[in-house]
């Protein structure tokens, strides 16, 4: 999906209003310095591409974040404010249902969500020069 035509200000408002709080809740009990940010993004569409990938694609050591509250809200925000996004996700959702696993918070998942927090922060500051 090409995130170029999303309403970035609405997605930012959704993040600041509620998604950010869910990410903090997920990370509660973890020091903010515990993980290094290794994933970056260069502009808002790129940030959303990385956020979608890290939120919804299973990785080694973190099978699925998709059922977490922050993930459900992220998916909803993209569906609302990215035209045509929902339609592109129907097949992906059906595939995900087939391989659904029970929720387990592993250290790898915590690291992944820490990366997500960094991507969202970057998304919210699009004019900032890349380090």
């Amino acid at each position: 999906y090409d995130f170029t035509n999303c309403d970035f200000e609405k997605i930012k408002a959704a993040y600041l209003s509620t998604i950010s709080k869910d990410l903090i809740t997920y990370m509660s009990g973890t020091k903010s310095t515990e993980f290094n940010n290794t994933v970056s993004c260069s502009n808002r569409p790129h940030c959303l591409t990385e956020i979608q990938s890290l939120t919804f694609n299973p990785t080694a050591g973190c099978a699925s974040l998709a059922k977490e509250m922050f993930a459900m809200k992220t998916k909803a925000a993209l569906a609302i404010w990215c035209p045509g996004y929902s339609e592109t996700q129907i097949n992906a959702t059906q595939a995900m249902k087939k391989r659904r696993k029970r929720k387990v918070t592993t250290n790898k998942c915590l690291e992944q969500v820490s990366q997500l927090q960094g991507l969202w922060r970057r998304f919210n500051r699009p004019l900032l020069k890349q380090q």
Partner: nanobody, 132 residues
Framework: EVQLLESGGGLVQPGGSLRLSCAAS????????ITWFRQAPGKELEGVAY????????YYADSVKGRFTISSDNSKNTVYLQMNSLRAEDTAVYYC?????????????????????????WGQGTLVTVSS
Amino acid sequence: EVQLLESGGGLVQPGGSLRLSCAASGFTFGDYAITWFRQAPGKELEGVAYISNFDGMTYYADSVKGRFTISSDNSKNTVYLQMNSLRAEDTAVYYCAAEGRMGTHSRDSVYFWAFSALYDYWGQGTLVTVSS
């Protein structure tokens, strides 16, 4: 030019009823979500009730469930808030607000409808006072 015009506020006794109206113009009413917000003196804006003019889906704040009913008349471009069993704590300025994408994505909007930062257009407000 987009306009939202609220009316119907006033003074009512505890236990009484009022019906607020929000008349809209200047945008495609049938695609939009309209939400009633309220602000009591010294308090934050609170989302009260949401309706999608696209599919009629509604959401309510817990504090008004069972007492308030939101409805829409697309032929008149107007949204109503029927408020029954009013309490002193319902005293506030009531605003209606419109958003252009949450109307056609009402199920996904369950997470976001009550957040004022997401709305594009606002009315000027109508004061509701509940007092004996």
